[in-house]
């Protein structure tokens, strides 16, 4: 009588997370009598996956009816595979013992690798807004994938970026992996409508990469340019002074008119005009009664944009002569962190 052999025909199998894994095992004899047990790993720390005779294993079903006469097929199916199930599985024949079963012979083992899809990439930008010409950092994270090999690319409006650094963790063997990448992006005034895209390609995605996006509208602050002009009106003693606030983003803006340094009126921007590039324009005017002034009047349009230090533009209104355009700038203050747009 030939001695029983335990045959595991598959050296390795690969299964997608969520699917079932079938681990094949046959024996060549009914003798010696005793159960088949399946283990993950070898040695004293091995994990029992299935015991033909003892215990309950809700995720495991046998491929064959083990109660059928002369059954020698002890293949099992493990349902709902996760990356944590990866490892080498051994089909082990035990000999009936008293009181305990005695290990008789083991199969060569089948390595189960689990293909797990990466999570949808999450792209996050800086906490504070930044102005054009500044460089900002974006991060992209994706988790839970296996195997470790993965490709990550960055794009800005469809153009691939090259200034980024990527890490895949952990460095050693693991049931699943995470990727973390940081890209540097230089902002331009035209970036309100721009998007930064992180693209992740993995064997589980069948050539259909996952993408995470960030809108630069949440990152950029475009400071306004100011222009103050005056127009005569029909009534000889009135002058209309307008302040054109152009090309700003986000919308949140407050404008104050000063007459000789004294606050004349404060208003919050509304009914804005949107430009093609996503920035906004706004205009405010002040009707000045010239006859009420004996001396020249200095009119200042002061704008506070998105919580930043005010910028202003002044216009000198000559009372003695006919009105004529005359202006002087005050230098804008340094850019500060913005609040969210209104």
């Amino acid at each position: 009588e030939e001695e029983l052999q335990v045959i595991q025909p598959d050296k390795s199998i690969s299964v997608a997370a969520g699917e079932s894994a079938t681990l094949h095992c046959t024996v060549t004899s009914l003798i010696p009598v005793g159960p088949i047990q399946w283990f993950r790993g070898a040695g004293p720390g091995r994990e029992l996956i299935y015991n033909q005779k003892e215990g309950h294993f809700p995720r495991v079903t046998t491929v064959s009816d083990l109660t059928k006469r002369n059954n020698m097929d002890f293949s099992i199916r493990i349902s709902n595979i996760t990356p944590a199930d990866a490892g080498t599985y051994y089909c082990v024949k035990f000999r009936k013992g008293s009181p305990d079963h005695v290990e008789f012979k083991s199969g060569a083992g089948t390595e189960l690798s689990v293909r797990a899809k990466p999570s949808a990439p999450v792209v996050s930008g800086p906490a504070a807004r930044a102005t054009p010409q500044h460089t900002v950092s974006f991060t992209c994270e994706s988790h839970g994938f296996s195997p470790r090999d993965i490709t990550l690319k960055w794009f800005k409006n469809g153009n691939e970026l090259s200034d980024f650094q990527t890490n895949v963790d952990p460095a050693g063997d693991s049931v699943s992996y995470s990727i973390h990448s940081t890209a540097k992006v230089v902002l331009t005034r035209e970036d309100v409508h721009s998007q930064v895209i992180c693209e992740v390609a993995h064997v589980t995605l069948q050539g259909d990469p996952l993408r995470g996006t960030a809108n630069l509208s949440e990152t950029i602050r475009v400071p306004p340019t100011l222009e103050v002009t005056q127009q005569p009106v029909r009534a000889e003693n009135q002058v209309n002074v307008t302040c054109q606030v152009r090309k700003f983003y986000p919308q949140r803006l407050q404008l104050t008119w000063l007459e000789n340094g004294n606050v004349s009126r404060t208003e919050t921007a509304s009914t804005l005009t949107e430009n093609k590039d996503g920035t906004y324009n706004w205009m405010s005017w002040l009707l000045v009664n010239v006859s009420a002034h004996r001396d020249d009047v200095k009119l200042t349009c002061q704008v506070e944009h998105d919580g930043q230090p005010a910028v202003s533009k002044s216009h000198d209104l000559k009372v003695s002569a006919h009105p004529k355009e005359q202006g002087s700038n005050t230098a804008p203050g340094p850019a500060l962190a913005s609040a969210a747009p209104l």
Partner: antibody, heavy 121, light 111 residues
């Protein structure tokens, strides 16, 4: 340690009914086929009934001499097997053993101590 | 039903000698190369105890002086050397098909 303990035997009149019980311990009861075998001086050892697993839809098999009168059942949650005996006859007298079938092949590796049924008027 | 006929009905064997018990089936109990025959030992007041499975394989915990052989319809249980504690009744049982049946028993006496 595997243990099988029968109960429910006694003296019955012909035509009467009786239910034998067997409580198992020391093994995963739900993974084993269970059997009843009886023994009498007249007939020797006589296999009576078998009940298989949930995965076998609790299939049952009976000796011709008890078919239609005896019913084997099991309650895996209580690790128990039962033998309901109706329309008892004098020839049903004997020691009734509860048995574990180790390898789904009438491999009777563990027997209880038995419970005695006497059918007599 | 498959009928199992045991012989002899009883035998007396001297201590240390060989005891041979035969079991003949009315029909083959062998399929796919396996012989579905079992042997049991029963002592007074106790349930039967499994000795041999599938005709020739020793059940765990059973002394090696017990051995089984045979195929098809003819099977043998051997005990050698016989010891005093082997005094008992021995039964063969088949599982070739339903219903399972037992032999009539062989009573072994030690001289």
């Amino acid at each position: 340690e595997v243990k099988l303990e029968e109960s429910g035997g006694g003296l019955m009149q012909p035509g009467g009914s009786m239910k034998l019980s067997c409580v198992a311990s020391g093994f995963t009861f739900s993974n084993y086929w269970m059997n009843w075998v009886r023994q009498s001086p007249e007939k020797g050892l006589e296999w009576v009934a078998e009940i298989r697993l949930k995965s076998n839809n609790y299939a049952t098999h009976y000796a011709e001499s008890v078919k239609g009168r005896f019913t084997i059942s099991r309650d895996d949650s209580k690790s128990s097997v039962y033998l309901q005996m109706n329309n008892l006859r004098a020839e049903d007298t004997g020691i009734y053993y509860c048995i574990r079938d180790y390898d789904y092949d009438a491999y009777f590796d563990y027997w209880g101590q038995g419970t005695t049924l006497t059918v007599s008027s | 039903d498959i009928v199992l006929t045991q012989s002899p009905a009883s035998l007396a064997v001297s201590l240390g000698q060989r005891a041979t018990i035969s079991c003949r089936a009315s029909k083959s109990v062998s399929t796919s190369g396996y012989n579905y025959m079992y042997w049991y030992q029963q002592k007074p007041g106790q349930p039967p105890k499994l000795l041999i499975y599938l005709a020739s394989n020793l059940e765990s915990g059973v002394p090696a002086r017990f051995s089984g052989s045979g195929s098809g319809t003819d099977f043998t249980l051997n005990i050698h050397p016989v010891e005093e504690e082997d005094a008992a009744t021995y039964y063969c049982q088949h599982s070739g098909e339903l219903p399972y049946t037992f032999g009539g028993g062989t009573k072994l006496e030690i001289k």
